[in-house]
Interface confidence: low
């Protein structure tokens, strides 16, 4: 349905509050270095313009596309060239090239200071003094640090942020009430950002066929009672929503997401018995709830898949008639029967099935050729099962911190060219899989673990794409989305790597170590561990453990000393010398 004025249409659909929030998010995700006040000014100008278009859709410029309107507004920023360099060249282009240009300049690792949390009383005062500005600041700070954050979901986070302050700033013990809520929002927010980044990478790097395959598998697991046609409709709609959000079309994305939630709630009977409690909630909460809804129970009487996909003489005929539909149906049928499999495994199985049909349907006796196709799945299923089993055993044996260290060593040996901060960040997150998934029952472990690992490894791929340093990483990241994790798992010690020269400065520590939080201390120690492995890639576990134990003892000793700095100055060089000797 076409509208005379797109901006008026979206303003009316979304309402002023959501409209302004989404425009602020869009601008903050594009111009990540601009000051808050500059963005607020631009958003207010766009909002005032939208209101004139609501009043009269024929008014001047109201017929322009949102990309044109928003792009023109962004290009009015005076300091564009100084702040963003070549990104300013985007403004010389016409739509749609201009928007594509802005998208290409989104920075996944912007050079922004870490967010420091002020004292609770300071935050509560700011919240009470100007609630609207306080919440806008939250949207701005999150959006500029996470340029692919799922915008309608960010509005939901902002609503929860507001609710936390409204409740806790009136509590007797404000800090005890507020800080756990803020920690939870921070952790959930980082996870949400990373999950969305994988969706955008899937769409942008591998195309909508890859995303649709992912969505078929995931929705079929969630909604095993829904018919294939119903799942296909949801997949088509969901693909549109995420394509829009990943493309910076945040108003359309939020509007279409609301429409999808409405459709799902109106058609619960043909989708899932689990939607009811979501559908009673207000819009933002409802959409979030639907996205996170648990898997419905599997129908009791599902027949064997072999009849239609192996034993039938019509397999090649069906495949030839509509390859993607037939493969989509296969994926749907397999996924609804296997909530215990990761989505990535299901996609590997579909890929293996497709490869077999491609080969066998050209053979002299196709049926004989593909008769054993399901046997082919066995090793594909066993591999992630073994991986989860081995790593959960290791996690239970070591605990999270030491498990992270084991992964740090493992991944530094695989790809030592990758920057130390990236290796630390990625390995710490890989290590969190233990606490997140290993406590789950067997049937939930693999989907939890492997799909989480896919999200974390996508972060590695995204950071590496910005500054490529390793052919191995490029290969694993670009060749196949579904085989990324197995590709990284398969990497061994990089024999071609020339060890990094020893730099004593890297292993020089000061008394400020003692005032760091436990997490910051861990990061310091893990940074040193990565540097050690880069210096001695062939060091044994025992050697590294010895050095790290000595390091912990040295830091503990100096942090207990009366003159901490003097202790670090004296003991530090001894630690370095002893470490070099231990690793020689």
């Amino acid at each position: 349905d076409t509208h005379k004025s797109e901006v008026a249409h979206r303003f009316k659909d979304l309402g002023e509050e959501h409209f302004k929030g989404l425009v602020l998010v869009a601008f903050s995700q594009y111009l990540q270095q601009c000051p808050f006040e500059e963005h607020v000014k631009l958003v207010n100008e766009v909002t005032e313009f939208a209101k004139t278009c609501v009043a009269d859709e024929s008014a001047e410029n109201c017929d322009k596309s949102l990309h044109t309107l928003f792009g023109d507004k962004l290009c009015t920023v005076a300091t564009l060239r100084e702040t963003y360099g070549e990104m300013a060249d985007c403004c010389a282009k016409q739509e749609p090239e201009r928007n594509e240009c802005f998208l290409q300049h989104k920075d996944d690792n912007p050079n922004l200071p870490p967010l420091v949390r002020p004292e609770v009383d300071v935050m509560c005062t700011a919240f009470h003094d100007n609630e609207a500005t306080f919440l806008k600041k939250y949207l701005y700070e999150v959006a500029r640090r996470h340029p692919y954050f799922y915008a309608p979901e960010l509005l939901f986070f902002a609503a929860r942020y507001k609710a936390a302050f409204a409740e806790c700033c009136q509590a007797a013990d404000k800090a005890a009430c507020l800080l756990p809520k803020l920690d939870e929002l921070r952790d959930e927010g980082k996870a949400s950002s990373a999950k969305q980044r994988l969706k955008c990478a899937s769409l942008q790097k591998f195309g909508d066929r890859a995303f649709k395959a992912w969505a078929v598998a995931r929705l079929s697991q969630k909604f095993p009672k829904a018919e294939f046609a119903e799942v296909s409709k949801l997949v088509t709609d969901l693909t549109k929503v995420h394509t829009e959000c990943c493309h910076g079309d945040l108003l359309e994305c939020a509007d279409d997401r609301a429409d999808l939630a409405k459709y799902m709630c109106e058609n619960q009977d043909s989708i899932s018995s689990k939607l009811k409690e979501c559908c009673d909630k207000p819009l933002l909460e409802k959409s979030h709830c639907l996205a996170e809804v648990e898997n419905d129970e599997m129908p009791a009487d599902l027949p064997s898949l072999a009849a239609d996909y192996v034993e039938s003489k019509d397999v090649c005929k069906n495949y030839a008639e509509a390859k993607d539909v037939f493969l989509g149906m296969f994926l749907y049928e397999y996924a609804r029967r296997h909530p215990d499999y990761s989505v990535m495994l299901l996609l590997r199985l579909a890929k293996a099935y497709e490869a077999t049909l491609e080969k066998c349907c050209a053979a002299a006796d196709p049926h004989e050729c593909y008769a054993k196709v399901f046997d082919e799945f066995q090793p594909l299923v066993e591999e992630p099962q073994n991986l989860v089993k081995q790593n959960c055993e290791l996690f239970e044996q070591l605990g999270e911190y030491k498990f992270q260290n084991a992964l740090l060593v493992r991944y530094t040996k695989k790809v030592p060219q990758v920057s130390t901060p990236t290796l630390v960040e990625v390995s710490r997150n890989l290590g969190k899989v233990g606490a997140k998934c290993c406590k789950l029952p067997e049937a939930k472990r693999m989907p939890c673990a492997e799909d989480y690992l896919s999200v974390v490894l996508n972060r590695l791929c995204v950071l590496h794409e910005k500054t490529p340093v390793s052919e191995k990483v490029t290969k694993c990241c670009t060749e196949s989305l579904v085989n990324r994790r197995p590709c990284f798992s398969a990497l061994e010690l990089d024999e071609a790597y020339v060890p990094k020269a020893f730099n004593a400065e890297t292993f020089t520590f000061h008394a400020d170590m003692c005032t760091l939080s436990e997490k910051e201390k861990q990061v310091k120690k893990q940074t040193a561990l990565v540097e050690l492995v880069k210096h001695k890639p062939k060091a044994t576990k025992e050697q590294l453990k010895g050095v790290m134990d000595n390091f912990a003892a040295f830091v503990e000793k100096c942090c207990k000393a009366d003159d901490k700095e003097a202790c670090f100055a004296e003991e530090g060089p001894k630690f370095v010398a002893a470490s070099q000797a231990a690793l020689a």
Epitope: A352, K372, D375, Q378, P379, L380, E383, N386, P486, C487
Partner: nanobody, 125 residues
Amino acid sequence: QLQVVESGGGLVQAGGSLRLSCTTSGRAFIGYAMGWFRQAPGKEREFVAAISWFAGDTTDYANSVKGRFTISRDNAKNTVYLQMNSLKPEDTAVYVCAASSARPLSSRSDEYHYWGQGTQVTVSS
């Protein structure tokens, strides 16, 4: 159960070449990492070469054979090959092919679940 059968062994002079084949049946082949191991009389079994599952685009070799041996796979024929050039007397052994579903690529014998009987390679000086 996956059956693994090797062929192509024989007697060859030092400096010569041989091509070993390993064909699987019983279960399809594409999802297995494949490896070659060897065992000389009175010695431990040792890793020779491995190739990853699917397209086989990742390979691994023992240092002693690097640059002389090449492992490859043909998924359409359910076969993995070991091309051995510049053979030396110390390459004399029974060469055994194995399949692993433990990991996409492995050099560890304990991660291989299905083994062939082996084929004898003798290099004379």
